[in-house]
Amino acid sequence: HPSPAPPDQLNTSSAESELWEPGERLPVRLTNGSSSCSGTVEVRLEASWEPACGALWDSRAAEAVCRALGCGGAEAASQLAPPTPELPPPPAAGNTSVAANATLAGAPALLCSGAEWRLCEVVEHACRSDGRRARVTCAENRALRLVDGGGACAGRVEMLEHGEWGSVCDDTWDLEDAHVVCRQLGCGWAVQALPGLHFTPGRGPIHRDQVNCSGAEAYLWDCPGLPGQHYCGHKEDAGAVCSEHQSWRLTGGADRCEGQVEVHFRGVWNTVCDSEWYPSEAKVLCQSLGCGTAVERPKGLPHSLSGRMYYSCNGEELTLSNCSWRFNNSNLCSQSLAARVLCSASRSLHNLSTPEVPASVQTVTIESSVTVKIENKESRELMLL
């Protein structure tokens, strides 16, 4: 099968669109329920969480919330807005206006034009605060995830059925099948549909075999297929890599732990904008690549690839995709160079016969036996070799 075309909504930057970018999460949570997949719907407004308006709560929003939270779809029994309004009556003609009263125009609504979370918007002051609250119970006994792939958008395909996570057999597994997985998870489109042993084998049951999606299904379990318990082993666990998965490499340096920062995202390699590339971002990247910690951030070169990615980390994240990130599809990095990094595990730091000293690092000999590299002022670290 040909690879599905990238969905249009993924080609917008968050700066241009009110819809949620895949790097962001729908700002919603469920509270006071029997599990993390049921309860009162709350949306985040700046620093606070507010109950979502019940009057404008519909099945599309319920479905979107459940999917966004990884809770499968919405159950039919979800408490939705009733067919007739349970609202205080309109004021009698001639009454003084009450709209200025903030408590009467206070509740936000989650409004969705479809059942996917990236088609939703939080609209402030959409309802009078009449006490009616949106509630949902999700079908948490069915869920989907990608595991052991270095992020939520790549890995071995696992389905939750009857309270147990299990694999999908790779017989007939192709891009259409992977595309359904990626779209269901909010991970864009499928870049690769992978057979067994590309990721670590699963351990639980095998829930599906002979999966044959058209690519248009909303959920993987809507695709034709067979129960998987008989003919497959875990050496045949299906995998997928989605367009929203990010992987990184350093190029043009002495080894894999030094060079220009490149991220594979939405099917292509991109450079990273150095205008927001600070020690915390460099630290996260070096550690995630198994390259130790960041020693310096050499001055970048002009972008040789399309540079559209920005990261903002606190330094404690496991990977750059756990940081706040922004992919600007409209403009290349404006007035910036391509980010570069030198990690502590790079052999260019350990090969003392190499005459070249990386920029902004000066070499000092102490007592003629210990060589110390003094990092530039931003980091002020000493590294003993």
């Epitope: 009057a55 009733p82 004021p91 709209a99 609504a109 402030e124 002051h125 309802c127």
Partner: nanobody
Framework: QVQLVESGGGLVQPGGSLRLSCSAS????????LGWFRQAPGKEREFVAA????????YYADSVKGRFTISRDNSKNTLYLQMNSLRAEDTAVYYC????????????????WGKGTQVTVSS
């Protein structure tokens, strides 16, 4: 009883613009969230745009986002819909709606409907 009267409809060429107005009789106009729905021949009524009581929040159907702008003037008891880059598929009867309890995005919260004004986009 709030009476809503739409005006401004008519025939326009594709790519053209129109501005619809909706005037209300009610003195407590600002107590109502307002919006526009439309109905094309042989189709169900569909949501177009909504605005809250004070005009601080708006919401649009995907099909009109970026082309239509909803606004209100509480001092004139009037709701507006500025329609730009009109397409043949925008042809419909446009209805002004008012809701006391919530922005009129879903039909079950709507308290009052206008009688409608015809918009035809054709060359």
């Amino acid at each position: 009883q709030v009476q809503l009267v739409e005006s401004g409809g008519g025939l326009v060429q594709p790519g053209g613009s129109l501005r619809l107005s909706c005037s209300a009789s009610e003195r407590t106009f600002s107590d109502y969230a307002l919006g526009w729905f439309r109905q094309a021949p042989g189709k169900e009524r569909e949501f177009v745009a909504a605005i809250n009581w004070v005009g601080g929040s708006t919401y649009y159907a995907d099909s009109v986002k970026g082309r239509f702008t909803i606004s209100r003037d509480n001092s004139k008891n009037t709701l507006y819909l500025q329609m730009n880059s009109l397409r043949a598929e925008d042809t419909a009867v446009y209805y002004c709606v008012a809701s006391w309890g919530a922005m009129p995005v879903l039909t079950h919260v709507i308290n009052y409907w206008g009688k409608g004004t015809q918009v035809t986009v054709s060359s």
